[in-house]
């Protein structure tokens, strides 16, 4: 806490300029009017203040706006934003996408800080849902943003926003998240033709059920192995050898290299060896000829 001292004669700041870097902490406190600082916040980012001086400037704004800064000030915080605590940010009401962009720009190239996470949370809650423009902005700055949300939070993403999602935005999503996103993507892209649809839906397929994979296998999509390996195991297991062959097209040869990894390994164990042999890939571990396969899960369901 900086002591309240009178401003020395002739040192009262008329504007926020570089002369202030020569002021001691107490002089800044005494000689810079908080209202002047608020109206000229944009100048702070072009002046080489010390960290200590920035702490004083922040303190002045905190005193002027104890209930939280107005958006006109927030938008021009620049690197002073990095001095804010999540508690400070929780007092803000940020509604403009331009303000959000300005503050994200300050932290660009670095992982999401607690300040940024709080800011985004406040912004999205204020909007009520993750609209397309917001999602566009957030994923541009933080490609992994979508996958940092819980399935519950993802449920508020409208299907129209899915158009903003790029494949790399889903890289770190787990199956639970893709389970939520896939139906939205299916809805968003439903009016596209076969090949275009597959290009768009491909990165969401980790949430696809068996029946959708079966449908895709009838459309000559030539799914690559990387996508296949991300499919839900429970969705892949019921697929027949013929369906997987159609689904992968020329990429079917890649199954050999993945035969020890899920979901390929588990799928092989469920196929007849005779059927696997038709692929000519030397896949081993299928059900030997003459063996009867009982679907115990079906039996349990009936009883």
């Amino acid at each position: 806490e900086v002591e309240k001292t009178a401003c020395p004669s002739g040192k009262k700041a008329r504007e926020i300029d570089e002369s202030l870097i020569f002021y001691k902490k107490w002089e800044l406190e005494a000689c810079v009017d908080a209202a002047l600082l608020a109206t000229q916040m944009d100048r702070v980012n072009a002046i080489p203040f010390t960290y200590e001086q920035l702490d004083v400037l922040k303190h002045k704004l905190d005193e002027l706006y104890p209930q939280g800064y107005p958006e006109s000030v927030i938008q021009h915080l620049g690197y002073l934003f990095l001095k804010m605590s999540p508690e400070d940010i929780r007092k803000w009401n940020v509604t403009s996408l331009e303000t959000l962009k300005a503050l994200l720009e300050v932290n660009k190239g670095h992982e999401m800080s607690p300040q940024v996470a709080t800011l985004i949370d406040r912004f999205v809650k204020g909007r009520g849902q993750l609209d397309k423009d917001t999602l566009d902005t957030l994923t541009a700055f933080y490609p992994g943003y979508l996958c940092s949300l819980s399935p519950e939070e993802l449920s508020s993403v409208p299907p129209s926003s899915i158009w903003a999602v790029r494949p790399q935005d889903l890289d770190t999503c787990d199956p639970r998240q893709l389970d939520v996103l896939y139906p939205k993507a299916r809805l968003a892209f439903q009016n596209m033709n076969g090949s275009e649809y597959f290009v768009k839906i491909q990165s969401f397929l980790g949430g696809a059920p068996t029946e959708d994979l079966k449908a895709l296998s009838q459309q000559n999509v030539s799914m690559d192995l990387a996508t296949f390996m991300k499919l839900r195991t429970d969705a892949v297991l019921p697929l027949t050898v013929a369906e997987v062959q159609k689904l992968l097209g020329p990429h079917v040869e890649g199954l050999k290299a993945e035969e020890r990894h899920r979901p390929v390994r588990d799928w092989i164990l469920r196929q007849r060896q005779d059927d696997l042999d038709t692929l000519g890939l030397g896949l081993q571990g299928g059900i030997p000829n003459g063996y009867l396969v009982l679907d115990l899960s079906m039996q349990e369901a009936l009883s």
Epitope: P48, Y51, E52, Q53, L54
Partner: antibody, heavy 119, light 107 residues
Framework: QVQLVESGGGVVQPGRSLRLSCAAS????????MNWVRQAPGKGLEWVAV????????YYADSVKGRFTISRDNSKNTLYLQMNSLRAEDTAVYYC????????????WGQGTLVTVSS | DIQMTQSPSTLSASVGDRVTITCRAS??????LAWYQQKPGKAPKLLIY???SLESGVPSRFSGSGSGTEFTLTISNLQPDDFATFYC?????????FGQGTKVEIK
């Protein structure tokens, strides 16, 4: 006068960890940000990380993100660099350096401590 | 990330020469550029900050200029003590990037 003295360097095997320290004196340590900069043998300078005065803001070069952690103890006037999962390419002289603000250069440097990652 | 490119990488000169080293930033950094001098086995030493401001105690034969993306360091009357490697560096709120260095050696 300002003095920065690094310690903790040495020879370490790939995959192992090491912690460097930098003892500061001659200025108000808690007022300024501290950086680590490294220099591989015969190569140029590479900025590694910075920690702001109060310790909550930390930023890293992409080459060390997720492996190195910068920290400070303002009560002891000491800066640290925890280096995990070390690689041969981390072999370098590590310098600590001070900056006084977000738009300030590195005005004081220590003499450096050598870290060699080798099996 | 902002990339800094220095040229030349090596410069041969004689005592008394005027030497110029160039530094180019991959995007505008306003005037937030510093120049450092480093001698073998020693820590770097700050010469110039904010593109053209001379650090206290640095001889006036060193000068810097430029803004935006193009910067130069000039040594007007090269002295025996000036043979060293020089680095430019951009600095902003949370990161610093160095140029690859320019070695000034005796011709």
């Amino acid at each position: 006068q300002v003095q920065l003295v690094e310690s903790g360097g040495g020879v370490v095997q790939p995959g192992r960890s090491l912690r460097l320290s930098c003892a500061a004196s001659g200025f108000t340590f808690s007022s300024d940000a501290m950086n680590w900069v490294r220099q591989a043998p015969g190569k140029g300078l590479e900025w590694v990380a910075v920690i702001w005065n109060e310790g909550s803001n930390k930023y890293y070069a992409d080459s060390v993100k997720g492996r190195f952690t910068i920290s400070r103890d303002n009560s002891k006037n000491t800066l640290y660099l925890q280096m995990n999962s070390l690689r041969a390419e981390d072999t370098a002289v590590y310098y600590c350096a001070r900056d006084r603000g977000p738009l300030w250069p590195l005005d004081y440097w220590g003499q450096g401590t050598l870290v060699t990652v080798s099996s | 990330d902002i990339q800094m490119t220095q040229s030349p990488s090596t410069l041969s000169a004689s005592v008394g020469d005027r030497v110029t080293i160039t530094c180019r930033a991959s995007q505008s950094i306003s005037r937030w550029l510093a120049w450092y001098q480093q001698k073998p086995g020693k820590a770097p030493k700050l010469l110039i900050y904010k593109a053209s401001s001379l650090e206290s105690g640095v001889p006036s034969r060193f000068s810097g200029s430029g803004s935006g993306t193009e910067f130069t360091l000039t040594i007007s009357n090269l002295q025996p003590d000036d043979f060293a490697t020089f680095y430019c560096q951009q600095y902003n709120a949370y990161s610093r990037t160095f140029g690859q260095g320019t070695k000034v050696e005796i011709k």
